[in-house]
């Protein structure tokens, strides 16, 4: 019997309000055994996949999606979905990325602290959380 897959969660580091030109990393989380995490824009046809999955905790895996230099085109809602054979999960809640013009430099500390959306709270980091890998290849229209 197939297991019921928990919904993924999504969060953003360092936050959801990012100065133009700064970097942001979306973090998707799901159960152990996820082979592919997908980060989607509001339209499901625009997405990015990774199989570089790591442990977030003994019971969770995670994947990270980094945008090096945020532009206005990166603003908008994002959500996660994952593939754990033999099926895809439901989508996470949406997380809205806001891009703001800033007079400070690209690393000025005026971002909101890490924000997340999803059914579970992000567990605190531990000494083993060095963000580890996963498998199987899918076609992707790149988000960035």
């Amino acid at each position: 019997q197939e297991e019921d897959l928990p919904r993924p969660s999504i969060s953003a580091e360092p936050g959801t309000v990012i100065p133009l030109g700064s970097h942001v990393t979306f973090v998707c989380r799901g159960p152990v055994g996820v082979q592919t995490f997908r980060l989607e824009r509001e339209s499901r046809s625009t997405y990015n996949d990774t199989e570089d999955v790591s442990q977030a905790s003994p019971s969770e895996s995670e994947a990270r999606f980094r945008i090096d230099s945020v532009s206005e085109g990166n603003a908008g809602p994002y959500r996660c979905i994952y593939y754990k054979p033999p099926k895809w999960s439901e989508q996470s809640d949406y997380l809205e990325l806001l891009v703001k013009e800033t007079s400070g430099g690209p690393d000025s500390p005026d971002t909101e602290p890490g924000s997340s959306a999803g059914p579970t709270q992000r567990p605190s980091d531990n000494s083993h959380n060095e963000h580890a890998p996963a498998s199987q290849g899918l076609k992707a229209e790149h988000l960035y």
Epitope: V32, T50, E51, P58, S59, R66, G137
Partner: antibody, heavy 117, light 107 residues
């Protein structure tokens, strides 16, 4: 079909260097973390090194036994994984496998590295 | 580092037997555990990942169970092609340590 083909093994003297390569095909290389695992003759398996993807800043991890001597790297434009081995010791003699991460689901056929004077 | 203790180191069994191999982690690893089969002169083959998930193409007579620190690989009815060495590996944190292996031989 997923394929991982290692090359570059051979006989080298203690203190010498060798560079192993692993040509990957049949999957999306640049979204996968990759590993090297070795097996000394008649012995068990030992994880050697791992490299992550661009999303994770190509982070690298090493077994203590090879730290500061071995360097894992990748060229995503060539779908190739590398292992640069310096200051080789006799105890580095082993078959070296290239392995796709994180569940180590595909392995190459291995390449034999012999360190002997 | 997380130590993985596998037992037994070898066992003799007959075709049709039920075979159980255990792996003990020195600290909790949740379900970040894999099992591999290796035949002489060949690369290891993934059997089980995430402690209980069967890898693609692996016969259903293989199953994995356990979480935390205690794990088991079971072969429900041993077949001639199953005589090999089996390894567990923790994938929770680097270094990704393997168990010492279990050699399954013909009785």
């Amino acid at each position: 079909e997923v394929q991982l083909v290692e090359s570059g093994g051979g006989l080298v003297k203690p203190g010498g260097s060798l560079r192993l390569s692993c040509a990957a095909s049949g999957f999306t290389f640049n979204i996968n973390a990759m590993n090297w695992v070795r097996q000394a003759p008649g012995k068990g398996l030992e994880w050697v090194a791992r490299i992550r993807t661009k999303n994770n800043n190509f982070a690298t991890y090493y077994a203590d036994s090879v730290k500061d001597r071995f360097t894992i790297s990748r060229d995503d434009s060539k779908n190739t994984l590398y292992l640069q081995m310096n200051s080789l010791k006799t105890e580095d003699t082993a078959v070296y496998y290239c392995v796709r991460g994180p569940y180590f689901d595909y392995w190459g056929q291995g390449t034999l590295v012999t360190v002997s004077s | 580092d997380i130590q993985m203790t596998q037992s037994p180191s070898s066992l003799s069994a007959s075709v049709g037997d039920r075979v159980t191999i255990t792996c003990l982690a020195s600290q909790t690893i949740g379900t970040w555990l894999a099992w591999y089969q290796q035949k002489p002169g060949k690369a290891p083959k993934l059997l089980i990942y995430a402690a209980t998930s069967l890898a693609d193409g692996v016969p259903s007579r293989f199953s994995g169970s356990g979480s935390g620190t205690d794990f088991t690989l079971t072969i429900s009815s041993l077949q001639p092609e199953d005589f090999a060495t089996y390894y567990c590996q923790q994938l929770y944190s680097t270094p990704y340590t393997f168990g010492g292996g279990t050699k399954v031989e013909i009785k």
